[in-house]
């Protein structure tokens, strides 16, 4: 990018530059016509017969440098060929010299600084590439010369440019003084400000464009070269903030449109809102869940919104004494999640009708909650109680939902309690063919013992056909028809209105070898 300090092509009024010395044949300001056929202010000198060593000077007005360290001067000029000038002396030249003089203010006068090299600083002696020629019988032909010179380094507030003619016939058609600067640049969402290079290369810190944030790593920088070009160098740039995506060739961040979102800063574009969510504003980093839908705390911001599951279905119960096996089917609606678990709530009602949450004497296997399989075994049920189990399905967002959790209930009533096992069997009398047995009356919780069943078999005869049963209403029994001197295993169970209790432990008894021993009372 070029910043103009002076462009005579744009001047409409007389330039009124200073000439030295004030003599005939000096530089003269004239109107000219440029390539675009616009009238321009020019300076012409054509003193080709002057005395050798005599110089004509032309000096511009004071030009503020505006922070530039190096200034460029583009000269457009025409020059007559000495050979085409019949009256040109040996002092005719086809070159001129350019100088500059620095000062902190417009202090130059018609006589100062002295019109010579030092104090003026020589920039270059300029030779014409194209000479205007005239041959007999033909029109004059020529082309405009264009030459760009570099001034500097400059340090004072401004400068004058001066032209020294020592015998040329030439016209200075235009002078363009400018400096080069790196234009404001936006790359990788990073804005680098317009920069005037102070040296060969200058590092320039960038700043993120609106709605962008710095990428990890060193802060973005780019190098501005002396020629006004940014050095092509990879930069760690910026990236669009959440809710914004890169646009217009990575030069700006555009807010995500309604119905789209971008959860993180960085590359990537806005995505449509995931299932069961929406964004009603532009620039959304996250889409809001629809009513009744949620995201778990551990769900990514871009995850779909989910809902608690419906209730489990078809609870099946299998009661076995004081144990209960429950199993069920998965809910129809999982809520869109994989983290499905089950939990049970339990209430128990006593035979008298008073109900309360289940006590701590129940055990659940594998547990009452966080079940991943659709079954549970409940142990420790009390007889003649009615149990209500509510089976609920839960997922990662159940805790976020308000309102009742749907459940599937099942009611189970346990049988009344049977008598306990009969133990402490003792042999009151034995003979070679009989055994008399007695036992303590068990404490039946649900009514009196109605009768007993005695189960016995000869030791060593294990088959079902060898087992014999005897019913008795008393807490004693006589086993007849037994083998002489044989061992028998005996078990007893009691029956109440609730049914038979379990058989007690096997009791080991033996018949007598002969009659002579008679009845012998034995303690079991």
């Amino acid at each position: 990018l070029e910043e103009t300090l002076l462009n005579t092509k744009l001047e409409t009024a007389d330039l009124k530059w200073v000439t030295f010395p004030q003599v005939d044949g000096q530089w003269e300001e004239l109107s000219g016509l440029d390539e675009e056929q616009h009238s321009v202010r020019t300076y012409e000198v054509c003193d080709v017969q002057r005395a050798p060593g005599q110089a004509h000077w032309l000096r511009t007005g004071w030009v503020p440098r505006r922070g530039a360290v190096h200034v460029y001067a583009t000269l457009r000029f025409t020059m007559l060929e000495c050979l085409s000038l019949p009256r040109a002396g040996r002092s005719c030249k086809e070159t001129f010299t350019v100088f500059y003089y620095e000062s902190d203010a417009d202090t130059a006068t018609a006589l100062t600084p002295a019109w010579m090299e030092n104090p003026y600083i020589k920039v270059d002696t300029v030779a014409a590439e194209h000479l205007t020629r005239k041959r007999p019988g033909a029109e004059a032909t020529g082309k405009v010369n264009v030459k760009t010179l570099r001034l500097g380094p400059l340090s004072k507030a401004g400068f004058y440019l001066a032209f020294q003619d020592q015998g040329a016939c030439m016209a200075l058609l235009s002078l363009h003084l400018f400096y080069k600067k790196c234009a404001q640049l936006t790359v990788n969402l990073t804005r680098f400000p317009e920069t005037v290079p102070r040296e060969l290369v200058v590092p320039v810190a960038g700043s993120c464009v609106v709605d962008a944030v710095p990428a990890p790593g060193p802060s973005p920088s780019l190098y501005c070269r002396e020629d006004g070009q940014w050095a092509e160098q990879p930069v760690t740039g910026c990236s669009c903030a959440p809710g914004f995506e890169a646009a217009e060739g990575n030069t700006k961040c555009r807010a995500c449109a309604q119905g789209t979102f971008k959860p993180l800063s960085g590359e990537g574009s806005c995505q449509p809102c995931p299932a069961n969510s929406h964004s009603n504003t532009i620039g959304s980093a996250v889409c809001q869940c629809r009513v009744g839908y949620f995201r778990a705390r551990t769900d990514p911001r871009g995850a779909p919104c989910t809902t608690p599951p419906s209730a489990p279905r078809s609870v099946v119960s299998r009661l076995n004494g004081s144990s209960l096996h429950l199993e069920w089917s998965a809910p129809l609606e999982s809520g869109g999640r994989e983290d499905l678990t089950y939990a049970l709530r339990c209430r128990e009602c006593r035979p008298g009708g008073s109900c309360a949450p289940c006590g701590g004497d129940l055990t659940f296997d594998p547990g009452p909650r966080d079940l991943v399989e659709p079954w549970v075994v409940v142990r420790g049920l009390r007889p003649d109680f009615t149990y209500t189990f509510e089976v609920t399905a839960l997922n990662g967002v159940s805790s976020l939902a308000t309102g009742p959790v749907p459940f599937e209930p099942v009611n189970v009533t346990t049988d009344r309690e049977v008598p306990p096992a009969v133990s402490d069997i003792r042999v009151t009398r034995s003979s070679p063919s009989s055994l008399s047995l007695a036992w303590a009356v068990p404490r039946a919780p649900s009514g009196a013992v109605l009768d007993y069943e005695v189960k016995y078999h000869e030791k060593g005869a294990e088959g079902p056909s060898s087992v014999r049963f005897l019913k008795t209403s008393e807490n004693r029994a006589e086993l007849r028809g037994l083998k002489r001197g044989a061992s028998y295993l005996v078990q007893v169970r009691a029956r109440s209105e609730a049914g038979y209790g379990p058989f007690g432990q096997e009791h080991h008894s033996q018949t007598q070898l002969d009659e002579s021993e008679g009845w012998r009372e034995q303690l079991a």
């Epitope: 003269e28 004239l30 109107s31 000219g32 016509l33 440029d34 390539e35 056929q37 020019t42 012409e44 054509c46 080709v48 025409t78 020059m79 007559l80 085409s84 000038l85 019949p86 009256r87 205007t132 005239k134 007999p136 019988g137 029109e139 004059a140 020529g142 405009v144 016939c169 030439m170 016209a171 058609l173």
Partner: antibody, heavy 126, light 106 residues
Framework: QVQLVQSGAEVKKPGSSVKVSCKAS????????ISWVRQAPGQGLEWMGR????????NYAQKFQGRVTITADESTSTAYMELSSLRSEDTAVYYC???????????????????WGQGTLVTVSS | DIQMTQSPSSLSASVGDRVTITCRAS??????LNWYQQKPGKAPKLLIY???ILQSGVPSRFSGSGSGTDFTLTISSLQPEDFATYYC????????FGQGTKVEIK
Amino acid sequence: QVQLVQSGAEVKKPGSSVKVSCKASGGTFSTYAISWVRQAPGQGLEWMGRIIPIFGTANYAQKFQGRVTITADESTSTAYMELSSLRSEDTAVYYCARSSYTILTTYYNYNAMDNWGQGTLVTVSS
Amino acid sequence: DIQMTQSPSSLSASVGDRVTITCRASQNINNFLNWYQQKPGKAPKLLIYGSSILQSGVPSRFSGSGSGTDFTLTISSLQPEDFATYYCQQTHSQSTFGQGTKVEIK
């Protein structure tokens, strides 16, 4: 503003010559084209020729070739037009005119003439 | 030599009229064409050069156009001081004037 001041009216005999001068005042002279244009009474303009003083040589219209000589003196900033073998039909007002731009200061040399002398009446009569 | 033919040779018009004068070259002269205005007893005055460039100080009601062989001078709204004779001039090769167009009051 440049002024072109021409010499006074002339009365000439047929067959003679006339030399009209045109002095430029104020500024550059050498690199402008100076043209000579004549206008017979009640007639149109007629271009005769042109000189660029710095080059010394002139260009002439075919019609006047051999009869007209245009010269310039850079030291006095004066241009001259001499017409020989005068005839009665050469009776006219003779104008010098300077081009709008020097040969060095125009990209397109249209040789348009924006400065004119006041004119010199030359009468050819026996 | 290049011949320049102007038309019409004369025309009558009223103040405020739009006036058009044409000039035709016998061969291509690009845009090396100039227009002059001359009033009786006066030297010509340059109006337009390079076919269409208005000379400094000339009113903008004057305009020129054309390239190659056909050219036009237009006065958009004739003023009392515009009654004069107008000449075209080619400078492509040597120089030649047209025969002139006299603009008179109607």
